[in-house]
Structure formats: structure tokens, C-alpha cells
Interface confidence: low
């Protein structure tokens, strides 16, 4: 039998048919055991492991009465087989059995889809004793059915290690379609096809799907669930949802936004973290990614000097961590710096350009044309040089550092002198006679000491020699800068 409870699930009568054995006239059971939430029957036995039950199992009692009449087979009486009702309605169903009084400690348990129901349900077992048999009615009620209550319910009774199983009662909870798969937000390439999926279930089946794009239906005819919508491509953002229809009505999925991948917005807030003579550390805040992850960024650097040739240096880096050290820059120079980042669609515009300056560096070249000669009359060594080219000093010249090393048999002694920026000559006292003096000069800026010139050697004789020929930095190609006087 199929019973459909559409508007109201009326409780089923306790007795689906005439019940053998006399009941009390007021139909009040002598014993009633309610099993509310946390249901644990008072006379609980240990059930066998749940398996796929055989419907309507029958136990044949081996005991006879005083008159030696065989007892009838024990079996649950037939009851309603299929109940259909709407979500949130109440339902009550039961199974009943007559058990000879010779059996003690009988109890009925409820099972759903092979699992025993132990809690969160309302089960009542009622006992109606008679002279020879006790009528047992087990009622099961659900006050507000949900989809999860769908399934096959059975009663089980254990007697003398025999298990008696009732016919199943199928509960079918019908309601609005329920989504098992809804469309998901996506970021797609312009004019490129993509798929959206929507799946909904009943009961009741079938469930039909309509697709909606920006509040307008996409398909004229519904498709049976599940439905895959192939969108051939979009040129602008759109919102999609799906409508699921069944006999109970309509459910609408969440609306999902499909974004069109675009070129990213330019980075913002490019700032200088640190400057040295030859490098600048910058950071930036990435712009909007255009719905596609950033792949890498390009730092564009051009000299801010109006006399420069305007060429742009480009440094590529990964998109993270929004930080880059620009190297190989000139000292004491002004630069304009811009940042552009790319995603799979393309490059952003360049960020607003910012101005940055490198600091002073140490000179990059040594003083030129270093000449050393002995002034024996005053027991001094005179040193002369040419200032290094201004462009390559990397900063404002503050002076020079002179290194002079005196070597004679077994003795080596190095001394350092500092001289002011205006000079291009210096005089140092002879430290050791009959020795070689090796002189090297470096230019000095606030950024540091530059490279030393090639060494120039002069021999300082014992007292009494007279010669004023100088030693000097050799011309290019000369292998040995030693001049012995």
C-alpha cells in the first residue's frame, strides 16, 4: 500500500487490521514503555550484527500449549508499506505482533536502512496482555520530517535467539528540490568558453533545471538535473544562478559572479625603502589583479637627468614579495622609477613614476699619472698625481689617501697619509735609506675610499747619492713600474 500524506500526515491506527485476542474495553494498554530521545528499550537484548534483513522473518515456536495445540508462527503483522509526505510534517507508523505469554523479556527495536535507531526519535512500545498471548505494538513517530528521514524502517524482535523482522515501511519525504551541486564563481578569459554545473534532487523527481544569467533565463526549455551550462564566452562580468523545479515548487541556487580576466591595474604606492651608491630598494602595493594571479613585475628605471639619453633600464622580478633591489646604478644620480605587473592576460600600465637618488659612493677610479721622486737635499719623497675624472668619482672628492711601503733587507713598513682634496702633490719623509719605497694613491669621497693606483717604486739610496730623476706610473704596456735611481 502507498499512502501519500501531502498536507498532513495523520497518525496511522494502532492496528492496521483486526487484532486477535481480547483487549481491554477502554483500549488502554496495561503497559506502555515510551522511548524518547536517547531511546534505550527497558528490556533490551543484544541484537545480532545488522545486516541486510530478511523481510518478514518468521520464528516457529517449538513449545505447545496444555492441549498440545501447536502455536502459530510468530510474525509481524502486515502494515502500511510506503508513506509519502512533505518535509516538516509529522508522521507515525507502527508494527505489531502477538507473542505467546510463555515468552518472557521480549522487546522490539527499530532499524533504519540497516542501522539501529537509538536516539533522537520517539518510539513507544505498548503491551496488551491476554490469556494466552500479548499483543505488542511498537509505534515510531517523527514530529517534523526532514530529507534525512527518508529510508526503509523495520522492526526487529528477538525470541529464543531467533530474530523476527517486520516488512519494511518506506518513508519518502518530499520537498522542494535540494541542491547537491551549485554553480561556482569563476574567473574566465574574455570570449573563452566555460562550463557551469547545477544538480538538484527530490523527491519528488524529476528535478528540472533552468539557468539564469543576469536575471534572465538562458534556456527556453528546462533540462533534467544534473545540468551543465556551456557558456561560449563573455565580454563582461555576469551573474549566473540556476532554478531547480519539481512538483513541490522551485528552489533557486546562490548567484555566482563570473568575472572576466583583464589586464591588472597599475601598482600603487611605489616607495623607496633604502638607497646606496649603486642600488635602490623599492617596494610597491600591487593594483587589482584583474581576476588573474600576478605572474611577474617589471621595474622600469630611467635617468632623471634631462641631459641623459632617456634610455630605460628594465628589471624583471617575481610578483612577490612586492620588493626589489635595483642594482648597477650610478652613484649620486637621480632616477625615475615605475613598476608594471602582469597576469596571464597582459601587463598593467606603469605605476605613477617616483623620483629616487643614489647616495655618494667611493670613487670608482684611482688618481692618474702618479709620479714619485726623491728630494735628497731635504730627505723627502715628493709625490704628484692627477685628479681622477670627475664623473667617475661617484661623489664629492674630500681628499686622497697615500700608502707608502718601505722595504729593505728584512724590513717592511707601511704608512698611510691623508691629504686634502685641493692638493695634487704631497711630500713624505724618507723613512729608511738603502730601501725601496712603493707608493699608491686612492681618491676619497664621503662614500668611501676608491681603488688605489698602480704601485710606483723608487729606490732610496744610502746617504750621499744625488739624483733627481722621478719614478712614475708607467705608460700603458710597461710591465715593470720600478725605476731605480
Amino acid at each position: 500500500a502507498i499512502t501519500e500524506a501531502r498536507e498532513e500526515a495523520k497518525p496511522y491506527p494502532l492496528f492496521p487490521g483486526p487484532f486477535p485476542g481480547s483487549l481491554q474495553t477502554d483500549h488502554t494498554p496495561l503497559l506502555s514503555l515510551p522511548h524518547a530521545s536517547g531511546y534505550q528499550p527497558a528490556l533490551m537484548f543484544s541484537p545480532t550484527q545488522p545486516g541486510r534483513p530478511h523481510t518478514g522473518n518468521v520464528a516457529i515456536p517449538q513449545v505447545t500449549s496444555v492441549e498440545s495445540k501447536p502455536l502459530p508462527p510468530l510474525a509481524f503483522k502486515h502494515t502500511v508499506g510506503h508513506i509519502i509526505l512533505s518535509e516538516h510534517k509529522g508522521v507515525k507508523f507502527n508494527c505489531s505482533i502477538s507473542v505467546p505469554n510463555i515468552y518472557q523479556d521480549t522487546t522490539i527495536s527499530w532499524w533504519k536502512d540497516g542501522k539501529e535507531l537509538l536516539g533522537a526519535h520517539h518510539a513507544i512500545t505498548q503491551f496488551y496482555p491476554d490469556d494466552e498471548v500479548t499483543a505488542i505494538i511498537a509505534s515510531f513517530s517523527i514530529t517534523s520530517v526532514q530529507r534525512s528521514d527518508n529510508g526503509s524502517y523495520i522492526c526487529k524482535m528477538k525470541i529464543n535467539n531467533e530474530e523476527i523482522v517486520s516488512d519494511p515501511i518506506y518513508i519518502e519525504v518530499q520537498g522542494l528540490p535540494h541542491f547537491t551541486k551549485q554553480p561556482e564563481s569563476m574567473n574566465v578569459t574574455r570570449n573563452t568558453a566555460f562550463n557551469l554545473t547545477c544538480q538538484a534532487v527530490g523527491p519528488p523527481e524529476p528535478v528540472n533545471i533552468f539557468w539564469v544569467q543576469n536575471s534572465s533565463r538562458v534556456n527556453e526549455q528546462p533540462e533534467k538535473s544534473p545540468s551543465v551550462l556551456t557558456v561560449p564566452g563573455l565580454t563582461e562580468m555576469a551573474v549566473f544562478s540556476c532554478e531547480a523545479h519539481n512538483d513541490k515548487g522551485l528552489t533557486v541556487s546562490k548567484g555566482v559572479q563570473i568575472n572576466i580576466k583583464a589586464i591588472p591595474s597599475p601598482p600603487t604606492e611605489v616607495s623607496i625603502r633604502n638607497s646606496t651608491a649603486h642600488s635602490i630598494l623599492i617596494s610597491w602595493v600591487p593594483g587589482f589583479d584583474g581576476y588573474s594571479p600576478f605572474r611577474n613585475c617589471s621595474i622600469q628605471v630611467k635617468e632623471a637627468d634631462p641631459l641623459s639619453n632617456g634610455s630605460v633600464m628594465i628589471f624583471n622580478t617575481s610578483a612577490l614579495p612586492h620588493l626589489y633591489q635595483i642594482k648597477q646604478l650610478q652613484a649620486l644620480a637621480n632616477y625615475s622609477i615605475g613598476v608594471s605587473c602582469m597576469n596571464e592576460i597582459g601587463w598593467s600600465a606603469v605605476s605613477p613614476w617616483i623620483l629616487a637618488s643614489t647616495t655618494e659612493g667611493a670613487p670608482s677610479v684611482a688618481p692618474l699619472n702618479v709620479t714619485v721622486f726623491l728630494n735628497e737635499s731635504s730627505d723627502n719623497v715628493d709625490i704628484r698625481w692627477m685628479k681622477p675624472p670627475t664623473k667617475q668619482q661617484d661623489g664629492e672628492l674630500v681628499g686622497y689617501r697615500i700608502s707608502h711601503v718601505w722595504q729593505s733587507a728584512g724590513i717592511s713598513k707601511e704608512l698611510l697619509e691623508e691629504v686634502g682634496q685641493n692638493g695634487s702633490r704631497a711630500r713624505i719623509s724618507v723613512q729608511v735609506h738603502n730601501a725601496t719605497c712603493t707608493v699608491r694613491i686612492a681618491a676619497v669621497t664621503r662614500g668611501g675610499v676608491g681603488p688605489f693606483s698602480d704601485p710606483v717604486k723608487i729606490f732610496i739610496p744610502a746617504h750621499g747619492w744625488v739624483d733627481y730623476a722621478p719614478s712614475s706610473t708607467p705608460a700603458p704596456g710597461n710591465a715593470d713600474p720600478v725605476l731605480i735611481i
Epitope: 578569459t189 574574455r190 570570449n191 573563452t192 561560449p232 564566452g233 565580454t235 580576466k261 597582459g346 601587463w347
Partner: antibody
């Protein structure tokens, strides 16, 4: 096989308008942009604009705004371009081309071109 | 707009010769956005190379492309008579889409 067939040559008077057409076949018409490109005798190629047949979305080269109007008829898979207020400067070969947009933009199929002559 | 400058404007080559045509962009473009077309007199342009270095369907392997940033080139490894045509570069990075002025390759 993708094919773009264009309408025949046109001779029109200055100040008039003309409508050129481009019929597509061999692919799903609504999926790709149709672009229009101008080529004057002995000169290079100039992009006029595109139209996306699925919803009529258009993008024009600023230089041709007001000069060209792009349209489509999806039922016949035909794109058209109307040129207004014609002058001798508009005399050229006009190509339609299918735009392939795969994170970039290039023209993978071209029509044979329509020659437009503007002369009194 | 991104102006594409092609050089040389005209080049004459004998069969078997190696030819290189360059295309310089006024703004940086990713290599994904630079494409080359071949046009023979009286015909429509034909896609030759897309995304800087990918040969379009049916294009012989003697054609190749390379480049990055603002500088791109098209090379014909060994010139053949059928390669006499005008070659255009095109950028797809920004609207308006632009073409180079073209390089005419003639047969010596």
C-alpha cells in the same frame, strides 16, 4: 573549415553611406569577435574595431568612431560595417577578420576584402 | 597607442638567403601579444606567426620569430620565391590594435 565571405566592390559618391557585409561559416559565429581592418592602396593595415556577435558588444578605434558602425545578424551569421559621410580618404580595401582572443589578440582568419571607391 | 616601427621598409633577397625583419614597439609588450602576417599582392593578410614565435597552421619551418619587451624580429632561414610578400607585425596588447607599416620582401 572557417570561411569569411565579403560583399562585392562598391563605387559610391562622396557624402553617401555604404554597408559592407561579411558572412561567416565553418565555426560557431557567436563565439569569436569579427574585426574590420582598412587598407588603403600602397599603405599598411588599420584596425577599425570589433564586434562580439553573441551580444553585439563593440570596441572601436577612436579614429573610426562616428565613421564606422558595426553590426551583426546572428541568424545569418553575418557581420556588417556601415561607413558614413564618405570622402576619398575612405577609398580602401576593407577586410573582416576573425579575432582570436586567448589572453592576447590576433586575427586567425581573414575575408578576401571589399574594395570601396569613393568618387563623384 | 602603441606604435610599431618595422625595418627595413623594403628588402630584396635571392633564393637561399637568410632574411630578418625587425619590429620595434613604442611601449613594452609581452611576447604573447606580438604577431606576424604575410600579405601577397591582391590577397588578404594571412596569419604567419602568433605570440612572437608560434608558427600558424601550414606555415613552413623556415619562418621563425623571436623577441621580447619592445624589440621583435621575423626571420626566414632560407628565402624561397614564394616568400616574396609584404610582412606586417601586429600587437594585441592594447586597444587600438596596431600594425607595423609593413616590410616588402622582393625577389632579387
Amino acid at each position: 573549415q572557417v570561411q569569411l565571405q565579403q560583399s562585392g566592390p562598391e563605387l559610391v559618391k562622396p557624402g553617401a553611406s555604404v554597408k559592407l557585409s561579411c558572412k561567416a561559416s565553418g565555426y560557431t559565429f557567436t563565439t569569436y569577435d569579427i574585426n574590420w581592418v582598412k587598407q588603403r592602396p600602397g599603405l599598411g593595415l588599420e584596425w577599425i574595431g570589433w564586434i562580439y556577435p553573441r551580444d553585439g558588444y563593440t570596441k572601436y578605434n577612436e579614429k573610426f568612431k562616428g565613421k564606422a558602425t558595426l553590426a551583426v545578424d546572428t541568424s545569418s551569421s553575418t557581420a556588417s560595417m556601415e561607413l558614413h559621410s564618405l570622402t576619398s580618404e575612405d577609398s580602401a580595401v576593407y577586410f573582416c577578420a576573425r579575432g582570436y582572443y586567448d589572453n592576447l589578440y590576433y586575427f586567425d582568419n581573414w575575408g578576401p576584402g571589399t574594395t570601396l571607391t569613393v568618387s563623384s | 597607442e602603441n606604435v610599431l616601427t618595422q625595418s627595413p621598409t623594403t628588402v630584396a633577397a635571392s633564393p637561399g638567403e637568410k632574411i630578418t625583419i625587425t619590429c620595434s614597439a613604442s611601449s613594452i609588450i609581452s611576447s604573447n601579444y606580438l604577431h606576424w602576417y604575410q600579405q601577397k599582392p591582391g590577397f588578404s593578410p594571412k596569419l604567419l606567426i602568433y605570440r612572437t614565435s608560434n608558427l600558424a597552421s601550414g606555415v613552413p619551418a623556415r619562418f621563425s620569430g623571436s623577441g621580447s619587451g619592445t624589440s621583435y624580429s621575423l626571420t626566414i632561414g632560407t628565402m624561397e620565391a614564394e616568400d616574396a610578400a609584404t610582412y606586417y607585425c601586429q600587437q594585441g596588447r592594447s586597444v587600438p590594435l596596431t600594425f607595423g607599416a609593413g616590410t616588402k620582401l622582393e625577389l632579387k
